[in-house]
């Protein structure tokens, strides 16, 4: 498994304003997925989201969450795509091990499994958001 | 039965410009493909110009060549995709293709569907 | 970017064994589609993501490949099958791009 460069921990309103970009894009995704019609959501697939042991903005799962972004654009040619990655990668803070996700074989299957991450990832994103800004007012109180 | 009809071919002087357009029929644009614009020069092989896709951005990719002189836009209420040209030299002589691609495993093959041309050509 | 497709062209007999290569610059990750052009008309869709055969398109016809290496091959040559063949890349993303192979004109031997 491929591990990924070490980067200097961001400020966390560099954080912000990355999560707040990632936010913004994750809805475009899914509006265009979600365009697609007779595909249903599959409970077979879950995207790590937040981590309970860590601190925002350390808590977002970023190398998963881009391993599984990766795995969608060997479907899926959006250019969105491309851009989630880039940011996603600005959030990968030290080494850390690439997961490995099997793509699907069926056809059928590969739009739950876009469907159904991109669902997570937009959910995710807002999670991710909501952590950093209660993490900052606590941060100030 | 779904098609793309191109239109706005014809000659032109060299420098002048022209504006091509791809009407789609028999389906409506909506996301998860691209739509370009692909051309070929008399007895020559098929080149890329610029491609757009339909959803929730307009994003554009262009052949280095075509950027200043090439724009590429839509309008989803006509299910329409346009092409300006500008600048026009005699090796832009070609039939113009518009072409719909696409953005992965939707549809698979059902959205590789090509109009038959319109030839433009620049002569004074 | 770049697709280099070879032979630029190729005489050969009816109930010939024909491939055609496809070279891209970087990965493609197998977005790579595969066409028959004869005159006048506009491209005819034979492959797609690589190895896809196109609805419609003889089983004669496969194609194969990954990362930059790509092959379309025609096991048993029909006369209907005397064209120009391209190869192209269509991935939307930045990471890729756009293009065309450079085209194999295939006549009789």
């Known amino acids: 498994s491929h591990t990924l460069p070490v980067r200097l921990l961001r400020p966390s309103d560099d954080v912000q304003k990355i999560v707040e970009e990632l936010q913004s894009l994750s809805k475009m995704l899914l509006k265009d997925v979600e365009e697609e019609k007779g595909v249903l959501v599959s409970q077979n697939y879950t995207l790590p989201c937040l981590s309970p042991d860590a601190q925002p903005p350390n808590n977002i799962h970023s190398p998963a969450i881009r391993a599984y972004l990766k795995t969608i654009r060997q479907l899926d040619n959006k250019s969105v795509i491309d851009e989630i990655i880039e940011h996603l990668d600005k959030l990968i803070f030290q080494d850390a091990p690439e997961t490995n996700i099997s793509v699907p074989t069926d056809t059928h299957e590969c739009k739950r499994f876009i469907l159904t991450i991109s669902q997570q990832f937009s959910e995710c994103m807002d999670l991710a958001l909501k952590s950093l800004t209660s993490g900052a007012q606590q941060a100030t109180t | 039965q779904s098609q793309l009809v191109e239109s706005g071919g014809g000659l032109v002087q060299p420098g002048g410009s022209l504006r091509l357009s791809c009407a789609a029929s028999g389906f409506s644009f909506s996301a998860n493909y691209w739509i370009c614009w692909v051309r070929q020069a008399p007895g020559k092989g098929l080149e890329w110009i610029v491609c757009i896709y339909i959803g929730s951005r307009a994003d554009t990719y262009y052949a280095p060549w075509a950027k200043g002189r090439f724009t590429i836009s839509k309008d989803n209420s006509k299910n329409t995709v346009y092409l300006q040209m500008n600048s026009l030299r005699a090796e832009d002589t070609a039939v113009y293709f518009c072409?719909?691609?696409?953005?992965?495993?939707?549809?698979?093959?059902?959205?590789?569907?090509w109009g038959q041309g319109t030839l433009v050509t620049v002569s004074s | 970017f770049q697709l280099t497709q070879s032979p630029s062209s190729l005489s050969a007999s009816v109930g010939d064994r024909v491939t055609i290569t496809c070279q891209a610059s970087q990965s493609i990750e197998s977005w790579l589609a595969w066409y028959q052009q004869k005159p006048g008309k506009p491209p005819k869709l034979l492959i797609y993501q690589a190895s896809k055969l196109a609805s419609g398109v003889p089983s004669r016809f496969s194609g194969s490949g990954s990362g930059t290496d790509y092959t379309l091959t025609i096991s048993s040559l029909q006369p209907e099958d005397f064209a120009t063949y391209y190869c192209q890349t269509y991935y939307g993303g930045g990471h890729i791009g756009w293009g065309f192979g450079t085209g194999t004109k295939v006549t009789v031997l």
């Open positions: 072409a719909r691609f696409s953005s992965g495993i939707y549809d698979l093959d059902r959205f590789f569907l």
